[in-house]
Interface confidence: low
């Protein structure tokens, strides 16, 4: 599923991401834009053999199990395929664990490079939330 910007903002808000660990909703929408272009089925393989899955590009080295990443920790205790669902519950729940891990949203390279320090509220402007 490819979400619309405001559609995703509303879904993320429903799932409790607005101001989760101090990160406003705009940060999450911005991260999703530059990680996956709002596509729940986005996957990207990394040169270390791991793969990033879903709308927030969650990595199989640490957070989920895809059965083919040596040394995977599966800290979210989920199959990576769950992160590709049009239902973003699994991605949100795992993202909450990631952002609580100490580095905050810096765990997402796209957020660090494209969203951090920018006017992230622009990503929810005009949305009926």
């Amino acid at each position: 599923k490819v979400f619309g910007r405001c559609e995703l903002a509303a879904a993320m808000k429903r799932h409790g991401l607005d101001n989760y660990r101090g990160y406003s909703l705009g940060n999450w929408v911005c991260a999703a834009k530059f990680e996956s272009n709002f596509n729940t089925q986005a996957t990207n393989r990394n040169t270390d053999g791991s793969t990033d899955y879903g709308i927030l590009q969650i990595n199989s080295r640490w957070w989920c199990n895809d059965g083919r990443t040596p040394g995977s920790r599966n800290l979210c205790n989920i199959p990576c395929s769950a992160l590709l669902s049009s239902d973003i519950t699994a991605s949100v729940n795992c993202a909450k664990k990631i952002v609580s891990d100490g580095n905050g949203m810096n765990a997402w390279v796209a957020w660090r490079n494209r969203c951090k320090g920018t006017d992230v509220q622009a990503w929810i402007r005009g949305c009926r939330l």
């Epitope: 089925q41 996957t43 393989r45 040169t47 053999g49 895809d66 059965g67 083919r68 199959p79 990576c80 395929s81 769950a82 590709l84 669902s85």
Partner: antibody
Framework: QVQLQESGAEVMKPGASVKISCKAT????????IEWVKQRPGHGLEWIGE????????YYNEKFKGKATFTADTSSNTAYMQLSSLTSEDSAVYYC?????????WGQGTTLTVSS | DIELTQSPATLSVTPGDSVSLSCRAS??????LHWYQQKSHESPRLLIK???QSSSGIPSRFSGSGSGTDFTLSINSVETEDFGMYFC?????????FGGGTKLEIK
């Protein structure tokens, strides 16, 4: 050991549809992407798309959207590619491969001939 | 789409020669470049993954190098079994794309 066994050669008429199968053995089928690749003489190798059997997630090369449809049956460890509205341009060898970004394991190929 | 251009299209060599095959990408693909060998009426076989990592069971005479947009497959002292087609492939972005191939033939 990992093996991908594709279905046999097909001769089809223009306008018809065909379904090619790829049976996987020797690994956990549901967690690896199955890729589909087309090869025509003089046209090299073309990536058609991929399916993740465990979730049914698919990605298609824009060029093949509407032409190819991927499905997978995890109970039989078999992936399928259906090609519709066949024309002579679809005559080719079609390969399935196990995807890891790179393709370390390939099926033997299915030769499709479209002829009236 | 990322275009991969292979050169030369055909390379005529004598067994024992050492050769280099080139693959150039239309934009940077980091190290997400892989090489395959294909003999007539056979499936492609992975030789090198991620520019320089040898695939399992591949002879040490095959090696890869490069980064960004320019990549090379080298064969040190070609053997008769090495003749065939060689393709590069990128996995940096979708759609995955292949080069047009280099035919390695006996002189």
């Amino acid at each position: 050991q990992v093996q991908l066994q594709e279905s046999g050669a097909e001769v089809m008429k223009p306008g018809a549809s065909v379904k090619i199968s790829c049976k996987a053995t020797g690994y956990t089928f549901s967690t690896y992407w199955i890729e589909w690749v087309k090869q025509r003489p003089g046209h090299g190798l073309e990536w058609i798309g991929e399916i993740l059997p465990g979730s049914g997630s698919t990605y298609y090369n824009e060029k093949f959207k509407g032409k190819a449809t991927f499905t997978a049956d995890t109970s039989s460890n078999t992936a399928y590619m259906q090609l519709s509205s066949l024309t002579s341009e679809d005559s080719a060898v079609y390969y399935c491969a196990r995807g890891d970004g790179h393709y370390g394991y390939w099926g033997q190929g299915t030769t499709l001939t479209v002829s009236s | 789409d990322i275009e991969l251009t292979q050169s030369p299209a055909t390379l005529s060599v004598t067994p024992g020669d050492s050769v280099s095959l080139s693959c150039r990408a239309s934009q940077s693909i980091s190290n997400n470049l892989h090489w395959y060998q294909q003999k007539s009426h056979e499936s492609p076989r992975l030789l090198i993954k991620y520019v320089s990592q040898s695939s399992s069971g591949i002879p040490s005479r095959f090696s890869g190098s490069g980064s960004g947009t320019d990549f090379t497959l080298s064969i040190n002292s070609v053997e008769t079994e090495d003749f065939g087609m060689y393709f590069c492939q990128q996995s940096n972005s979708w759609p995955r794309t292949f080069g047009g191939g280099t035919k390695l033939e006996i002189k």
